[in-house]
C-alpha cells in the first residue's frame, strides 16, 4: 500500500470518477527534511485540500461537467514557510458518469426535401446535446426514427444517421416521394445516450415536419471535350439549374485532383478553364452543388461526366533501353525469337496508338544483312534467312523503328545466340512418394522440394527449368516456385486443402524450358515426376449461415406460430441437430431437423424485447461438434395492458370538515409501448353515482385531478372509482380505486384514537 497511496513529492496524475464518494484521500506525500509541511495551489475549487502531513484529499463529490481536469501544484515548505521542494504538477482527471440526459435543441424541426433527392444525402439535421463526456458511451448519442406519418404500405421513406442525426431519404423515398400524392410528412425522432445500447440510457424526443417539393435539379448529359484545345478558355460545356432562383453553385472534385480544370458561375453554367490532357486523365467525374445563402446544401449533388477525346500527341515508347532476346544455334527459319512490345500513351485501339514496326539496322551484318524480320503490326521478331552460329557471331544488335501515324521512335534489341536446346530437363526422381497433410495446413507452406537438371548452356533459356503441375490439381491448390540459380522447385500450398472434395490427389509435374527444344528432341518420361498427396480430415464444427438471426413478430401471435428459422451446414456433410439454449422464459421450441423456431407459450413484449436465445447446431454422429449462433426475436407491441395507477395512493386524506372544495393529483401509466411523447390517457369517474360528490379533470396525457364538488362529506373513508382509457387499438380501460379519507386533523395530520386498526393516512390534501 505504501507505494500506491503514499510516496515522495513528484509529478503525478490521478483519475477519479465524478459524483461518487463525497470525500476521499487521494495520496499522502512524504516530506524530506527540512520540509515539514505542504502547500496546494492551482485549480483547487475549494474541493482539493492538502494537510500539513501531506494528505491530499477532496472534500466533496467531483463534477466533470464543471471541470474535467484540475491542474494542481504541491510544494513542500520548511518551518519558515519557504518552499524547499517543488512545486510539482498534480493532475486530477475527472472521469465521467452518465448523469446528464440528452436534450434536443428544438422540440420541433421543419424541413423540405425535393422528390427524387439522392438517398442517404442529408436534407435536415436534428441535434441533441448531452453534457456527459462524448469520448465515453455516456455522451454518445443514438438517434432513431420512432414513427413516420403517414406510413404507406409499411415503407419508410426517411432514415436517420443514428450518430449524426442527419435525416435523408431511403431508396424507396427517393423513388416514391411525390408531392402531388403526399406533400407533407411528420417524423418523431428519439435520441438516447449510452450509444443506444443500454437499458439505463436517458432519452428525449422531437418532432420533424417535412414538406416534399418538385425537382428540376437533374444531372446533364455526359460531355465530350477534345484534349489540348487551342480555343480561348474558359469554354462553356454544360449547365445545371436549381429549382428556385438565388442558389449558390459550386463544383466538388471528389477525386481531390492536384489541378481541377472546371468552374461554375452563379447562373449554373459549367466551364472548362484550361486545355485538358487525355493521357493525364481521360475522364472527369465531379459534382455540381447548389447551396443556400448560408452555405447549406439544398439537395444532393449532380454528377457531371466529362470524357476527354484523344488526339495523337504522344510518340511510341520502347519497353526498355535495350530489349534482350535469345535464339538457339541452328534454329529453323521462321522461328519466333521474341516480341518487342512498344507503348503509346494515346487512346488504346485507335489510330493514334496503332503501332508499326520496321528493322532499320542490323549489326554486325555477318554473315549477311537481313537475318531477322519483324512482323509489322505485332512486333514479333523471326529468323529470316538462315540458322545462326554462336562461334561466328554470338550477339546481334537491331535498331527498330516503331511508328504511329504521326511519330517515329527507335528501339534497340540485343539478340544473344545460345547453344541449341538439345537436352531435356531430367527429374532426379520420377516418384516423390506419398505425402500426408492435414486439411488445415497453412497456405504458403512448402510441402515438397523437387529437382530436375538440364545439361544445356547454364543460365540461358535452354537450361532454365519451369515446373508445371499438369495433372491431379484441377482446383489449383498447389503451385511450384523455381529457384533460378539451382532450378530447385518448391511445391507450396496456394489454396486451402479440402478432405471433403480431394482426399487423395495423384499429382504429375512436368519440367520444361522456356526455350523450344531443338527439332527432333522431345520431352519424355524423364521430364515428368509424380507424387501422391493424401489429405486427412480435420473435423470441423457446423457453420451457421449468419452470426445473428433476427425475426419480428407481433407479441400476440398464436401458440405454435413459426417465428423464425436458422440454418447451418456441416463441412463434413453430416446431418445437423438444432437445439435452443438460454430460452429462460420457455417461449420457444426448435425443430431439431429443419431449424424452424415456433412459439410454445404466450409472448409478452413488456417482459422484454428483443428476446435473445442461443441456437446450437450439433453434428449428428462424428465428434458431435457444435457451434452457436444468436436468435433475436423482436416483439411488436399490441395494446394488451390496461392503464393503472403509477404508484400506491393509499393514505390520501382531507381534513374534516372541509373549509373549501379540495383536490388531489394522481398519475396513470401502462406497460405498452408509447410512441410520440408518452401515453394519451382519458379519465372519467367510474360510476354515475360519484358525480354528485366528485369531479375528474385531465391535466395531460398521464395526470389528472380529482376534485370535491362540495364540502359536505362525512368523517370516513370514500373509495372513488376512476375509469382510465388508453385510446389504443383496441382501446383498453382500467378501473382504479382511489381511497380518500376525511378525518379530524391535529397539526395537519389525521388524528386516530388509540386502538384504531386501519392504517393511518400519510398524505394531506
Amino acid at each position: 500500500q505504501e507505494g500506491k497511496f503514499s510516496g515522495p513529492l513528484k509529478p503525478m496524475t490521478f483519475s477519479i470518477y465524478e459524483g461518487q464518494e463525497p470525500s476521499q484521500i487521494i495520496f499522502q506525500f512524504k516530506a524530506n527534511p527540512p520540509a515539514v509541511t505542504f502547500e496546494l495551489t492551482g485549480e483547487t475549487d475549494n474541493i482539493f485540500v492538502i494537510e500539513r502531513e501531506g494528505l491530499l484529499y477532496y472534500n466533496r463529490a467531483l463534477d466533470r461537467e464543471t471541470r474535467s481536469t484540475h491542474n494542481l501544484q504541491v510544494a513542500a515548505l520548511d518551518a519558515n514557510g519557504i518552499i524547499v521542494e517543488g512545486p510539482v504538477p498534480i493532475t486530477i482527471k475527472v472521469k465521467d458518469i452518465n448523469d446528464n440526459r440528452p436534450t434536443f435543441l428544438q422540440s420541433k424541426y421543419e424541413g423540405s426535401v425535393r422528390q427524387n433527392s439522392r438517398p442517404g444525402k442529408p436534407f435536415l439535421y436534428v441535434n441533441a446535446t448531452d453534457l456527459d463526456d462524448p469520448a465515453t458511451p455516456n455522451g454518445q448519442l443514438y438517434y432513431q426514427i420512432v414513427i413516420q406519418l403517414p406510413m404507406i404500405n409499411n415503407v419508410m421513406y426517411f432514415q436517420i444517421n443514428n450518430k449524426t442525426g442527419a435525416i435523408s431519404l431511403t431508396r424507396e423515398g427517393s423513388q416514391e416521394l411525390n408531392p402531388a400524392k403526399n406533400p407533407s410528412y411528420n417524423l418523431v425522432i428519439s435520441v438516447k445516450d449510452m450509444g443506444g445500447q443500454s437499458e439505463n440510457s436517458f432519452s428525449d424526443t422531437t418532432s420533424v415536419d417535412i414538406i416534399v417539393t418538385e425537382n428540376i435539379w437533374k444531372a446533364p448529359k455526359p460531355v465530350e471535350m477534345v484534349e489540348n484545345s487551342t480555343d480561348p478558355h474558359p469554354i462553356k460545356i454544360t449547365q445545371v439549374r436549381w429549382n428556385d432562383p438565388g442558389a449558390q453553385y459550386s463544383l466538388v472534385d471528389k477525386e481531390k485532383l492536384p489541378r481541377f480544370p472546371f468552374s461554375i458561375d452563379q447562373e449554373g453554367d459549367i466551364y472548362v478553364t484550361q486545355p485538358l490532357d487525355r493521357e493525364e486523365k481521360d475522364a472527369y467525374v465531379f459534382y455540381a452543388v447548389a447551396k443556400d445563402e448560408y452555405g447549406k446544401p439544398l439537395s444532393y449533388p449532380l454528377e457531371i461526366h466529362v470524357k476527354v477525346k484523344d488526339i495523337n500527341d504522344n510518340p511510341p515508347t520502347c519497353p526498355s533501353p535495350v530489349t534482350v532476346f535469345e535464339v538457339q544455334e541452328n534454329e529453323r527459319l521462321g522461328n519466333s525469337i521474341g516480341t518487342l512490345t512498344a507503348h503509346d500513351r494515346d487512346e488504346e485501339n485507335t489510330a493514334n496508338s496503332f503501332l508499326n514496326y520496321r528493322i532499320v539496322e542490323q549489326t554486325p551484318k555477318l554473315p549477311m544483312d537481313g537475318l531477322f524480320l519483324i512482323q509489322t503490326y505485332a512486333g514479333m521478331l523471326q529468323l529470316a534467312k538462315q540458322s545462326l552460329k554462336k562461334q561466328d557471331t554470338p550477339q546481334y544488335n537491331l535498331t527498330i523503328e516503331v511508328s504511329d501515324k504521326d511519330f517515329k521512335t527507335l528501339c534497340f534489341v540485343q539478340i544473344n545466340v545460345i547453344d541449341i536446346n538439345d537436352q531435356i530437363p531430367i527429374f532426379e526422381k520420377s516418384d516423390y512418394g506419398n505425402l500426408t497433410l492435414a486439411e488445415d495446413t497453412n497456405i504458403g507452406s512448402t510441402i515438397l522440394t523437387i529437382q530436375a537438371t538440364d545439361a544445356d548452356e547454364p543460365f540461358t533459356g535452354s537450361s532454365k527449368i519451369l515446373y508445371h503441375i499438369i495433372k491431379g490439381d484441377s482446383e489449383g491448390r498447389l503451385g511450384v516456385d523455381t529457384d533460378p540459380h539451382t532450378n530447385t522447385g518448391y511445391v507450396i500450398i496456394k489454396k486451402p486443402l479440402d478432405f471433403e472434395t480431394a482426399a487423395v490427389s495423384n499429382i504429375v509435374f512436368k519440367a520444361e524450358n522456356p526455350e523450344p527444344l531443338v527439332f527432333g528432341v522431345k520431352y519424355n518420361a524423364s521430364s515428368f515426376a509424380k507424387f501422391t498427396l493424401i489429405v486427412t480430415d480435420v473435423n470441423e464444427a457446423p457453420q451457421f449461415s449468419q452470426h445473428v438471426f433476427q425475426a419480428k413478430v407481433s407479441e400476440d401471435v398464436a401458440i405454435g406460430t413459426k417465428v423464425g428459422n436458422v440454418t447451418a451446414k456441416d463441412p463434413e456433410g453430416l446431418d445437423i441437430s438444432y437445439s435452443l439454449r438460454g430460452d429462460t422464459r420457455g417461449w420457444l421450441k426448435i425443430d431439431h431437423v429443419t431449424g424452424e423456431i415456433f412459439s410454445v407459450a404466450p409472448l409478452d413484449r413488456e417482459a422484454g424485447s428483443p428476446y435473445r436465445v442461443q441456437v446450437v447446431a450439433t453434428e449428428v454422429g462424428g465428434s458431435s461438434l457444435s457451434s452457436v449462433s444468436e436468435f433475436h426475436l423482436i416483439l411488436m407491441d399490441v395494446n394488451d395492458n390496461p392503464p393503472r395507477l403509477a404508484k400506491d395512493y393509499t393514505g390520501l386524506f382531507f381534513c374534516h370538515p372541509l373549509s373549501a372544495p379540495g383536490s388531489l393529483i394522481f398519475e396513470a401509466t401502462d406497460d405498452d409501448q408509447h410512441l410520440f411523447r408518452g401515453p394519451h390517457f382519458t379519465f372519467s369517474l367510474g360510476s354515475g353515482s360519484l358525480q354528485n360528490d366528485w369531479e375528474v379533470s385531465k391535466i395531460n396525457g398521464t395526470h389528472a385531478r380529482l376534485s370535491t364538488r362540495h364540502t359536505e362529506f362525512e368523517e370516513r373513508e370514500y373509495v372513488v372509482l376512476i375509469r382510465i382509457n388508453d385510446g389504443g387499438r383496441p382501446p383498453l380501460e382500467g378501473i382504479v380505486s382511489l381511497p380518500v379519507t376525511f378525518c379530524s386533523c391535529v397539526e395537519g395530520s389525521c388524528f386516530r384514537p388509540a386502538g384504531h386498526q386501519t392504517g393511518i393516512p400519510t398524505v394531506g390534501m
Epitope: 500500500q1 497511496f5 464518494e21 470525500s23 484521500i25 474541493i47 485540500v49 472534500n59
Partner: nanobody
Amino acid sequence: EVQLLESGGGLVQPGGSLRLSCAASGGTVSGYAMGWYRQAPGKEREFVAAINSGGPTWYADSVKGRATISRDNAKNTVYLQLNSLRPEDTAVYYCRRYDDYDSWGQGTQVTVSS
C-alpha cells in the same frame, strides 16, 4: 451538519491497548474519508491515521505497526485500535470527517501512565 462523538479513551498502562470509537449522528461516514488526530498538552494537533471508503489506510510514522483504523458503515462508526501504548501517546484524540465543512469531534482523552 454531522456531529462526531469520540469514546473509548481513558487511563491505560504502558504496553496496554485501547479501542477508540467515533460515532456519527446527523450525517453519515459512508462514502467519506475519515481520520484520527491527536493533540498532546502544549503541542500542535497531529495526524494519526486515515481511511477511505474503499479501504486504503494511512498512518503516521509514530504509530505505524501499533495502530489500526477501521470503519463500520452500517453502524456509522470509525474505530482506532492502539496497541503497545507508550507515555508519548498521551493526548486528546479527535475524529475527523474530511468534508467541505471540515467536521471534527470534541475529542477523547487517552492517558498512558503507570
